[in-house]
C-alpha cells in the first residue's frame, strides 16, 4: 500500500538535486581557486541536513547554520550588486565586470540558483513530487528560508556604495515583497553602507521616461533615507548598450547616456 504523501501547491524538488548541488560545488571550487579548501561532500551533507526529515513548513534559519558556516566566503564588501526581478542582466553584468558580485556569484548562491527542494517529516526521502508554495502553503519552506538566510547575510556584509539593479518594466519597479524589498534593504548596515545606488533598467526601446521618479522608487528612497543611508538612482535606457560599454568603456559611443 503506497504511503500517504503530503501534496503541496508548488513544484517538487528539482530532478538530480543531490548530484546537481555536489557538481555545482566542485565546479565552483574549480573556477574559484580561493575556495579550494571547501569540502564539497561536507557541504552537501550540511545542505541535506537542513531540510531532510523535517517538516517542509517548519524550516528555520538555524537549520541552515551548518551550511552557512561551511560556505563562509569573503567578497569585497564594496563590490556588491543586488537585483530584483532582473536576474539575467545582473549576472550578465558581473560576468563582464568581474570585480562585482551578485549573491549567485558566491558559493551558496551558485549552489541553489534556480533549484527547488524539500523533504518530508520523519523520512529521509527528498520530495520530488511537490514542495510548499510560499503564498499558497507556507513561507517557512526550505527554499524561501534558504534565500532569506543567504540574502540577509549578503546584505549585512555590504559596505560603501551598494548597487541594486531594478526592472523598470514591472508595474512595481521596487516591490516591498521581493527578497530585495523585504530582506536586503532592511539588512544593509548604516554604519558601513554610505549609499544605495539603484539602476533602473528600461525595457522599451523608445522609453525615455525618468523611471527614477516612479512612486515605488520614491518609496525605496524613503525607506533607505530613514535608515540613514544615502540614495541615488540612474536610468539605464539601453541595457544592451550598457553591457557593451562595460565591456568596452573606451568605445566613443559610451560617453553619452545609456
Amino acid at each position: 500500500v503506497p504511503r500517504w504523501r503530503q501534496q503541496w501547491s508548488g513544484p517538487g524538488t528539482t530532478k538530480r538535486f543531490p548530484e546537481t548541488v555536489l557538481a555545482r560545488c566542485v565546479k565552483y571550487t574549480e573556477i574559484h581557486p580561493e575556495m579550494r579548501h571547501v569540502d564539497c561532500q561536507s557541504v552537501w551533507d550540511a545542505f541535506k541536513g537542513a531540510f531532510i526529515s523535517k517538516h517542509p513548513c517548519n524550516i528555520t534559519e538555524e537549520d541552515y547554520q551548518p551550511l552557512m558556516k561551511l560556505g563562509t566566503q569573503t567578497v569585497p564588501c564594496n563590490k556588491i550588486l543586488l537585483w530584483s526581478r532582473i536576474k539575467d542582466l545582473a549576472h550578465q553584468f558581473t560576468q563582464v565586470q568581474r570585480d562585482m558580485f551578485t549573491l549567485e556569484d558566491t558559493l551558496l548562491g551558485y549552489l541553489a540558483d534556480d533549484l527547488t527542494w524539500c523533504g518530508e517529516f520523519n523520512t529521509s526521502k527528498i520530495n520530488y513530487q511537490s514542495c510548499p508554495d510560499w503564498r499558497k502553503d507556507c513561507s517557512n519552506n526550505p527554499v524561501s528560508v534558504f534565500w532569506k538566510t543567504v540574502s540577509r547575510r549578503f546584505a549585512e556584509a555590504a559596505c560603501d556604495v551598494v548597487h541594486v539593479m531594478l526592472n523598470g518594466s514591472r508595474s512595481k519597479i521596487f516591490d516591498k515583497n521581493s527578497t530585495f524589498g523585504s530582506v536586503e534593504v532592511h539588512n544593509l548596515q548604516p554604519e558601513k553602507v554610505q549609499t544605495l545606488e539603484a539602476w533602473v533598467i528600461h525595457g522599451g526601446r523608445e522609453d525615455s521616461r525618468d523611471l527614477c521618479q516612479d512612486p515605488t522608487i520614491k518609496e525605496l528612497e524613503s525607506i533607505i533615507s530613514k535608515r540613514n543611508i544615502q540614495f541615488s538612482c540612474k536610468n539605464i535606457y539601453r541595457p544592451d548598450k550598457f553591457l557593451q560599454c562595460v565591456k568596452n568603456p573606451e568605445d566613443s559611443s559610451c560617453t553619452s547616456e545609456i
Epitope: R16, E19, T20, A23, R24, V26, K27, E30, R36
Partner: antibody, heavy 120, light 107 residues
Framework: QMQLVQSGAEVKKTGSSVKVSCKAS????????MHWVRQAPGQALEWMGW????????DYAQKFQDRVTITRDRSMSTAYMELSSLRSEDTAMYYC?????????????WGQGTLVTVSS | DIQMTQSPSTLSASVGDRVTITCRAS??????LAWYQQKPGKAPKLLIY???SLADGVPSRFSGSGSGTEFTLTISSLQPDDFATYYC?????????FGQGTKLEIK
C-alpha cells in the same frame, strides 16, 4: 562511456576566424567545467580558457582575451571555441578537456584534438 | 602568471632504468600539480594529480612527490611504452600553466 569528440581539421587564412566544436557524451554536460588547451607544433601545452556549460560563464587567459570566445549549446552537449584574427602562430592542435572531480583539477578527459592550420 | 620549469628537457634512458623528472613552480602552488604523458599525435594522458595521487589505470611504476615549488615525477622501472613527452601543470591559480615538457627517449 565518457567521450569528448572534436570537429575535424581546419585550414584558415590569416585574419580569418575558426570555430572548433567539442561534443560531450556519457555524462551530464552541465556538471563539469570545460577547458580549452592548445599546442603549437613541437611546443608545450597552453591553457586558453574555460566555460561553465550550465550558465555559459567563461574565463580566458589574458593572452587570448581579445580574440577567443568560448560558448556552448546545452541541448547539443557541445562546447565551442572560436578564435578570431588568426595569425600563423595560431597554427596548433586545439583540445577540449575536463576534470573528473575525483582527480583534483587535473584534466582526466581530453578530446582527440583539432588541428588548425593558418596560412597566408 | 605562474611559471613552470621542467628539467631536463630531454632525457635518454634504457628499459628498466629508474628516471626522475623535476618541475619547479615560480611560486607556492601547494599540491595543485598534475603530470601528463603525451605521445606523438595523441592527446595528453593524466598520470598524477594533486602532486602525488595516481590517476585511474596508471601503472604503479609512476609516482609523484613534492609540494610548494619543487615536484618530481619518478618512473621506477622504464617500460618500452613509457618513451614519450611528459608535462607538469599547475592548477593552483588561473591561468593554468604547463611546463615546457621533458622528452624521454631511448638511449
Amino acid at each position: 562511456q565518457m567521450q569528448l569528440v572534436q570537429s575535424g581539421a581546419e585550414v584558415k587564412k590569416t585574419g580569418s576566424s575558426v570555430k572548433v566544436s567539442c561534443k560531450a557524451s556519457g555524462y551530464t554536460f552541465t556538471d563539469y567545467i570545460m577547458h580549452w588547451v592548445r599546442q603549437a607544433p613541437g611546443q608545450a601545452l597552453e591553457w586558453m580558457g574555460w566555460i561553465d556549460p550550465e550558465y555559459g560563464r567563461t574565463d580566458y587567459a589574458q593572452k587570448f582575451q581579445d580574440r577567443v570566445t568560448i560558448t556552448r549549446d546545452r541541448s547539443m552537449s557541445t562546447a565551442y571555441m572560436e578564435l578570431s584574427s588568426l595569425r600563423s602562430e595560431d597554427t596548433a592542435m586545439y583540445y577540449c578537456a575536463r576534470s573528473a572531480h575525483t582527480t583534483g583539477f587535473g584534466f582526466a578527459y581530453w578530446g582527440q584534438g583539432t588541428l588548425v592550420t593558418v596560412s597566408s | 602568471d605562474i611559471q613552470m620549469t621542467q628539467s631536463p628537457s630531454t632525457l635518454s634512458a634504457s628499459v628498466g632504468d629508474r628516471v626522475t623528472i623535476t618541475c619547479r613552480a615560480s611560486e607556492d602552488i601547494y599540491s595543485n600539480l598534475a603530470w601528463y604523458q603525451q605521445k606523438p599525435g595523441k592527446a595528453p594522458k593524466l598520470l598524477i594529480y594533486d602532486a602525488n595521487s595516481l590517476a585511474d589505470g596508471v601503472p604503479s611504476r609512476f609516482s609523484g612527490s613534492g609540494s610548494g615549488t619543487e615536484f618530481t615525477l619518478t618512473i621506477s622501472s622504464l617500460q618500452p611504452d613509457d618513451f614519450a613527452t611528459y608535462y607538469c601543470q599547475q592548477y593552483n591559480n588561473y591561468p593554468y600553466t604547463f611546463g615546457q615538457g621533458t622528452k624521454l627517449e631511448i638511449k
